[in-house]
């Protein structure tokens, strides 16, 4: 699987999950989140050659099409597969609130 | 929705489904399929700017991150959303077989 275990410990050039830290205030302009100040969101990057973690029959077909037509603009793309939630704390007035933000952290990628 | 109805009738520059005809023999090297000779597979292409058909909370965050960090390599990607099957006919000896190939035709796209 193109997950953090494999991708973070390798120098994989093809589609893989990459490290990305997002600071809520600086990178998103969200000043109201109290904790955490930011988080390891990660992102997906890298080419999707034929047979590389292809998601559907269609992505297999497209990768094969690409092999026969190397200059074509139609190609599978490296996108998130498994996503995890992130708990945050913010204040409503003086009252702290804990919210679980769904689908915030990329754990693995796929070619789609 | 970034579907064939909208995308094929517009000159949309952002992520949208585009027309692509795949010839089984020429483009995939599949000589064994009897019917059809090829099909309209379509493909997804175009940038994924802020707010453009974002798939998950993560893709919203990434699009917002991109607005604050325009040079970043982390960005949502335009990929298939709705896929449809394709019926094919091939021969096993002299006996024709009909097979439904799942997820073969792109009907709409999303930014993931």
């Amino acid at each position: 699987a193109l997950d953090t275990n494999y991708c973070f410990s390798s120098t994989e050039k093809n589609c893989c999950v990459r490290q990305l830290y997002i600071d809520f205030r600086k990178d998103l302009g969200w000043k109201w989140i109290h904790e955490p100040k930011g988080y390891h969101a990660n992102f997906c990057l890298g080419p999707c050659p034929y047979i590389w973690s292809l998601d559907t029959q269609y992505s297999k077909v497209l990768a094969l099409y690409n092999q026969h037509n190397p200059g074509a603009s139609a190609a599978p793309c490296c996108v998130p597969q498994a996503l995890e939630p992130l708990p945050i704390v913010y204040y409503v007035g003086r009252k702290p609130k804990v919210e679980q933000l769904s689908n915030m952290i990329v754990r693995s990628c796929k070619c789609s | 929705a970034l579907d064939t109805n909208y995308c094929f009738s517009s000159t949309e520059k952002n992520c949208c489904v585009r027309q692509l005809y795949i010839d089984f023999r020429k483009d995939l090297g599949w000589k064994w399929i009897h019917e059809p000779k090829g099909y309209h597979a379509n493909f997804c292409l175009g940038p994924c700017p802020y707010i453009w058909s974002l798939d998950t909370q993560y893709s919203k965050v990434l699009a917002l991150y991109n607005q604050h960090n325009p040079g970043a390599s982390a960005a949502p990607c335009c990929v298939p959303q709705a896929l449809e099957p394709l019926p094919i006919v091939y021969y096993v000896g002299r006996k024709p077989k009909v097979e439904q190939l799942s997820n073969m035709i792109v009907r709409s796209c999303k930014c993931s």
Partner: antibody
Amino acid sequence: EVQLVQSGAEVKKPGASVKVSCKTSGYIFMKYWMNWVRQAPGAGLDWMGQIFPAWGMTNYNEMFEGRVTLTADTSTSTAYMELSSLRAGDIAVYYCARGYGNYALDAMDYWGQGTLVTVSS
Amino acid sequence: DIVMTQTPPSLSVSPRETASISCRASESVDSYGNSFMHWYLQKPGQSPQLLIYLASNLESGVSDRFSGSGSGTDFTLRISRVEANDTGVYYCQQNDEDPLSFGQGTK
């Protein structure tokens, strides 16, 4: 230029629901909380609640007894306020107002033009 | 809930004079070194507009004839060299405690 443009005036029967829209432009919709405030004829301002559009996270004023529902559509940068079980006491101008951005509850720096809701049998 | 009480309920001021409006909160609205008190003006037939945030900060684009002061429970909005265009209802608002609340207004 930041703009919040609300839907037109509504006339509703008692017991019915009303849904008011607030279409925004000129800023990043997903960066700010959106508040809803109402003003009865000749009266002051009452805060109804707020939504953070990127997640649909909401905080409501208990005064509205669960009758108010706030939603947002990030694809069109539009916020919505639905008020159910309408009664005569709900006759008011309803405003959407953007939060200043430093806190969830905050000052409100941009306001819609207001939507008059009339309840009449 | 924090109750905001404004005085006076209405005020008539001659041009070029100074006007003062008071707002008293039923409990302190100070937290983390800030006073969570803001002031708005609602001109006839218009939506409210933010004048002062966090007790004393002038909102961008607002005339510097407006100034705010105070902390804890007692706050004041001052308008110097009053103009006819300043006519309207002035509201204070706190966001230190949920629910956010407004004063009843000073006309």
